[in-house]
Amino acid sequence: HEGVHRKPSLLAHPGRLVKSEETVILQCWSDVMFEHFLLHREGMFNDTLRLIGEHHDGVSKANFSISRMTQDLAGTYRCYGSVTHSPYQVSAPSDPLDIVIIGLYEKPSLSAQLGPTVLAGENVTLSCSSRSSYDMYHLSREGEAHERRLPAGPKVNGTFQADFPLGPATHGGTYRCFGSFHDSPYEWSKSSDPLLVSVTGNPSNSWPSPTEPSSKTGNPRHLH
């Protein structure tokens, strides 16, 4: 009877991108007092683990520890909660969480086409490239949960490249990119060197647009 209870949440600590041989803890938690949590992996090998839930402060949780990350442990994980000893009466599944092993292949290069400081409002494109024939590039921004991904373009000047259009700059951040091959989507390269993108300039909405009369001027808003 799947889905009797609402889905729990699944988190990875310290994060879902895990270096080879390093430790990651997958935490399944809910405000429903589940007695057990089941962790299911789709990947190179399907597998299900079961742990007794810990209860405190109105939350039930279980920590599944992967002590040494290897390629066969990478994949898509979901967790379920169970309120009885019967393994068949479980909650709806958590949202899927992709656990990726990183650091397997040579690092790509990441560059900003506009230089180290970007004007607020200007369109930013970050380029990830490598001499390795990666099929896919993944761009991560520090503090953001999800990466952007793009297929690598055809080989040009000895490199395979993907250009990530980020749109008009609003605030800066630190970016990294990774490469992967289509037959092993959970196995990524080493991280590129981090790229700090700084954004300068403040929107001034009180000023006229080029089509408006120019008498409508005022003091700028400072958004620092």
């Epitope: 290069s109 560059s111 607020a120 409002g121 700084s198 929107p203 001034s204 000023w207």
Partner: antibody
Framework: QVQLQQSGPELVRASQTLSLTCAIS??????????WNWIRQSPSRGLEWLGR?????????DYAVSVKSRITINPDTSKNQFSLQLNSVTPEDTAVYYC??????????????WGQGTLVTVSS | DIVMTQSPDSLAVSLGERATINCKSS????????????LAWYQQKPGQPPKLLIY???TRESGVPDRFSGSGSGTDFTLTISSLQAEDVAVYYC?????????FGQGTKLEIK
Amino acid sequence: QVQLQQSGPELVRASQTLSLTCAISGDSVSSNSATWNWIRQSPSRGLEWLGRTYYRSKWYNDYAVSVKSRITINPDTSKNQFSLQLNSVTPEDTAVYYCARDSPSYGRGVFDIWGQGTLVTVSS
Amino acid sequence: DIVMTQSPDSLAVSLGERATINCKSSQSVLYSSNNKNYLAWYQQKPGQPPKLLIYWASTRESGVPDRFSGSGSGTDFTLTISSLQAEDVAVYYCQQYYSPPYTFGQGTKLEIK
């Protein structure tokens, strides 16, 4: 070719507001690639970038911290010009003030076109 | 802010001789991502605004005579005039455009010996 023509009073009393205008010909203040800057030059401080205005779907500004609390740079699209206002001036603000264009052909922050300069004296 | 320091403050060179002006930045202005140095050189004659000579540390602006050349990388840069002409008498400034606020050197006054 692109030219910048400056105008404005050359003598300002301390504590008053310095106001200068820079008229653009051969380019547009609403250009989606250029930025429009004010730079000043004095014997004590040398060349000092003060700030800029630019348009990228909407108007933006960017000011040097040293003058941020006192400065306003505004575009005037109908006259294709931009202005500098510097409030609460002191004799330290006495300088030659230049308007300048920055074009992305050179990398952002390179000033390829300059106004003729206006010597503004702040009297106490 | 990035501080730009030029040396010498003034320089007297004979006509036809080589003039060398140095510029040092307080932090690197080389952007490793594109391997470009965000440094420009300007020439200013009395009563005139500065005129752009060189950008990307070594690329001459169109119309600038080829006796002017720029070199250097990271934090140390040089402007060289290979054979000084009378019209080169001016004050020369370096400027970083790596990050705002854009900052200039204090200037080097070049005279004829």
